[in-house]
C-alpha cells in the first residue's frame, strides 16, 4: 500500500500574485484534507462564513482517484498573506511534503513595502550560521543586511539570500550587531525591513540557585523576596519566568539583574511581593531558559497569620544516659516564627556557651550531669513565652 499525496491545482512551486487580488487553491486527495496557510486562525473558517482576513475553506468536487477535495479562498490578499500554503491529510499525523502533504509558496507582492516581518528578537549563539528572517513579498529582490554600523552583501558563502527564508549569515559576522535590518531598492525607492534586536547568547548555563533554598517563612503583611540566580557562560542571555500562587493575580514584580565577571555571567531575577497574605503561600518556581537549556528551581513559602511558639518533647520528658558517654543530645520538637530568643537552664541556673533551641548537646557526661534541663523560649514583641523541661538521669555502670 503506497500513499498517494494530495495534489494542488497550482502546479508551480511558487506562485506570484499582487496585493488586492483574490486567491483560490484547490486540493484533492485520497483522505480527508486540511489547509494551513499564513493567515489561518487557530480554527479555520468553514462553510459560508466568509472572512476577508482569514480566508475560507470549502468542499469541492473530487475525482475517482482523489475523492476528497478542499478549496481555499482568500479575497483581497495582502503582503502578510505571503508564505507557504499547505494542504495535508487531516487524520495522518506526519505532514510530509510529497507523501501526506502538498504545498505552494505564494508571494503577494506589495510594491509599497516589500518586507513583511514584524520587529523581533534574534538569539545569536555559536552555531555556524543562522537565518535572519526578513521575509519578502516580492521574489528576486537584491537584499542587503544592515546593522547599526555596517552593511553585509550576499556573497553566496558567508551571507546567503533566500526569497522564502531571509538571509543566512555566518554568526561571527553578527557578534557586533545591536540590531539588524534588511534593505532593498525597488524603482528609485529604498526599503528597510522591521528591525531584529540581536541578543548574543553563550551556549551554556552552569547552575541555578533559588534563595532562600528549601523554604521561607513569613508573617501576613511581611515582604517576600526571592532571588533566583543563574551562572552562565560569559556574555550569555537568559530569559527568566516564575510560577507562583499569585502570578495570575499579578501579585509581585520581578526585577532582572546581571553581573559580568571575568569568566562567567551571573544573571538574577528577584521576585518581590509586598504585604503577603495566606493567598501567597505555596510553591515558587524559578525557570531560566537560554533558548537551548532550561533550568528550574523551587522553594516553598509558608505564611503564618500570627507569631507563634510551639515546643514539645521529642523523646519524652525523661532521658537516660550513661556516665562516660562522650555526647548526649537533649532534643525538643520546636516550631516557631519568627525565630524566638531562648535560654537553656540546668536546675534553674542558666547555661553559658552557644546552644541550639532544637537540642542541648552535652559533652562528656558525668554523674553530675543528672538534673532538670529547661528550655525557655520567648518573643518579646509578640508577648509569647514557652518553657519545656527534660529530666536527665545518668546511670553509673
Amino acid at each position: 500500500y503506497s500513499m498517494t499525496p494530495p495534489t494542488l491545482n497550482i502546479t508551480e512551486e511558487s506562485h506570484v500574485i499582487d496585493t488586492g487580488d483574490s486567491l483560490s487553491i484547490s486540493c484533492r486527495g485520497q483522505h480527508p484534507l486540511e489547509w494551513a496557510w499564513p493567515g489561518a486562525q487557530e480554527a479555520p473558517a468553514t462553510g459560508d462564513k466568509d472572512s476577508e482576513d482569514t480566508g475560507v475553506v470549502r468542499d469541492c468536487e473530487g475525482t475517482d482517484a482523489r475523492p476528497y477535495c478542499k478549496v481555499l479562498l482568500l479575497h483581497e490578499v495582502h503582503a502578510n498573506d505571503t508564505g507557504s500554503y499547505v494542504c495535508y491529510y487531516k487524520y495522518i499525523k506526519a505532514r510530509i511534503e510529497g507523501t501526506t502533504a502538498a504545498s505552494s509558496y505564494v508571494f503577494v507582492r506589495d510594491f509599497e513595502q516589500p518586507f513583511i516581518n514584524k520587529p523581533d528578537t534574534l538569539l545569536v549563539n555559536r552555531k555556524d550560521a543562522m537565518w535572519v528572517p526578513c521575509l519578502v513579498s516580492i521574489p528576486g529582490l537584491n537584499v542587503t543586511l544592515r546593522s547599526q554600523s555596517s552593511v553585509l552583501w550576499p556573497d553566496g558563502q558567508e551571507v546567503v539570500w533566500d526569497d522564502r527564508r531571509g538571509m543566512l549569515v555566518s554568526t561571527p559576522l553578527l557578534h557586533d550587531a545591536l540590531y539588524l535590518q534588511c534593505e532593498t531598492t525597488w524603482g528609485d525607492q529604498d526599503f528597510l525591513s522591521n528591525p531584529f534586536l540581536v541578543h548574543i547568547t553563550g551556549n551554556e548555563l552552569y547552575d541555578i540557585q533559588l534563595l532562600p533554598r528549601k523554604s521561607l517563612e513569613l508573617l501576613v503583611g511581611e515582604k517576600l523576596v526571592l532571588n533566583c540566580t543563574v551562572w552562565a557562560e560569559f556574555n550569555s542571555g537568559v530569559t527568566f519566568d516564575w510560577d507562583y500562587p499569585g502570578k495570575q493575580a499579578e501579585r509581585g514584580k520581578w526585577v532582572p539583574e546581571r553581573r559580568s565577571q571575568q569568566t562567567h555571567t551571573e544573571l538574577s531575577s528577584i521576585l518581590t511581593i509586598h504585604n503577603v497574605s495566606q493567598h501567597d503561600l505555596g510553591s515558587y518556581v524559578c525557570k531560566a531558559n537560554n533558548g537551548i537549556q532550561r533550568f528550574r528551581e523551587s522553594t516553598e513559602v509558608i505564611v503564618h497569620e500570627n507569631p507563634f511558639i510551639s515546643v514539645e518533647w521529642l523523646k519524652g520528658p525523661i532521658l537516660e544516659a550513661t556516665a562516660g558517654d562522650e555526647l548526649v543530645k537533649l532534643p525538643v520538637k520546636l516550631a516557631a516564627y519568627p525565630p524566638p530568643e531562648f535560654q537553656w537552664y540546668k536546675d534553674g541556673k542558666a547555661l553559658s556557651g552557644r546552644h541550639s533551641p532544637h537540642a542541648l548537646v552535652l559533652k562528656e557526661v558525668t554523674e553530675a550531669s543528672t538534673g532538670t534541663y529547661t528550655l525557655a523560649l520567648w518573643n518579646s514583641a509578640a508577648g509569647l513565652r514557652r518553657n519545656i523541661s527534660l529530666e536527665l538521669v545518668v546511670n553509673v555502670p
Partner: antibody
Framework: QVQLQQSGPGLVKPSQTLSLTCAIS??????????WNWIRQSPSRGLEWLGR?????????DYAESVKSRITINPDTSKNQFSLQLNSVTPEDTAVYYC?????????????WGQGTLVTVSS | EIVLTQSPGTLSLSLGERATLSCRAS???????LAWYQQKPGQAPKLLIY???TRATGIPDRFSGSGSGTDFTLTISRLEPEDFAVYYC????????FGGGTKVEVK
C-alpha cells in the same frame, strides 16, 4: 535599580581635553544587552548624541560625525564605569554632558541617565 | 543624518486638557527606533515612550505614542501639574538624533 553617577571637572580651558567619567551601579558595563552613551545639551545645539561603547564579544564604539575626529569613549571593567574624552575643545563645546544607558529591552532608547555635568570651556 | 522636527515649539494648555505633540522625520524610520522623553528644568531627560508606542516602566497610561514612517505623535490625554515640561523625540536607528523639543506650559 540602575544608577549612573557622573564625575569630572566643570571648567576646561580651550584647546585642552574634556574628561568625564560615569560610574555604573545595578548593571555591568560589559553586559551584552546595553550600550553606554554620552549626550550633551546646550541652548544652541539642543540635545546632541556624542557616542557610545558596548561589549558584544569585543568592545565596540560608535561616534557622532560632528565629533568623530576628537572623541574617545572607553570602558573600565575593573571599576564598572566608562569615560568620555573630547580633545581640542572650544567654547562651542560648553554644555551639560549626560551619560545614559541604552538597553535592548527598550530597543536601545536611553532608560537611565546620569545627573548631568555642566562643562564650561573658557580661559 | 535624519533630522527630527517637532511641532509646535510651545504648547499652552490648561490642567486636564489633552496635549498632542508632533515629531516629523526627514526620512522614514522604523517605529522600533523612535522614543519620547520628558525633561524638567535642572533634570536629565526621562524616557516616556520607546518603539513609538510602548510606555517605559512606571510611566502613567495618560501618555501614549503613535505613528509610523515619518510622522509620530505623543499624546497626553489629561494634563496633570507634573506634566508641564519640555518633550523631545529621538530616533536611535543608524545614527542617533533628537528633535528640538516642544515646551508644554500652563495657559
Amino acid at each position: 535599580q540602575v544608577q549612573l553617577q557622573q564625575s569630572g571637572p566643570g571648567l576646561v580651558k580651550p584647546s585642552q581635553t574634556l574628561s568625564l567619567t560615569c560610574a555604573i551601579s545595578g548593571d555591568s558595563v560589559s553586559g551584552n544587552s546595553a550600550t553606554w552613551n554620552w549626550i550633551r545639551q546646550s541652548p544652541s545645539r539642543g540635545l546632541e548624541w556624542l557616542g557610545r561603547t558596548y561589549y558584544r564579544s569585543k568592545w565596540n564604539h560608535d561616534y557622532a560625525e560632528s565629533v568623530k575626529s576628537r572623541i574617545t569613549i572607553n570602558p573600565d571593567t575593573s571599576k564598572n564605569q566608562f569615560s568620555l574624552q573630547l580633545n581640542s575643545v572650544t567654547p562651542e563645546d560648553t554644555a551639560v554632558y549626560y551619560c545614559a544607558r541604552g538597553d535592548s529591552s527598550s530597543w536601545y532608547a536611553f532608560d537611565y541617565w546620569g545627573q548631568g555635568t555642566l562643562v564650561t570651556v573658557s580661559s | 543624518e535624519i533630522v527630527l522636527t517637532q511641532s509646535p515649539g510651545t504648547l499652552s494648555l490648561s490642567l486636564g486638557e489633552r496635549a498632542t505633540l508632533s515629531c516629523r522625520a526627514s526620512q522614514s524610520i522604523s517605529s522600533s527606533f523612535l522614543a519620547w522623553y520628558q525633561q524638567k528644568p535642572g533634570q536629565a531627560p526621562k524616557l516616556l515612550i520607546y518603539a513609538a508606542s510602548t510606555r517605559a516602566t512606571g510611566i502613567p497610561d495618560r501618555f501614549s505614542g503613535s505613528g509610523s514612517g515619518t510622522d509620530f505623535t505623543l499624546t497626553i490625554s489629561r494634563l496633570e501639574p507634573e506634566d508641564f515640561a519640555v518633550y523631545y523625540c529621538q530616533q536611535y536607528g543608524r545614527s542617533l538624533s533628537f528633535g528640538g523639543g516642544t515646551k508644554v506650559e500652563v495657559k
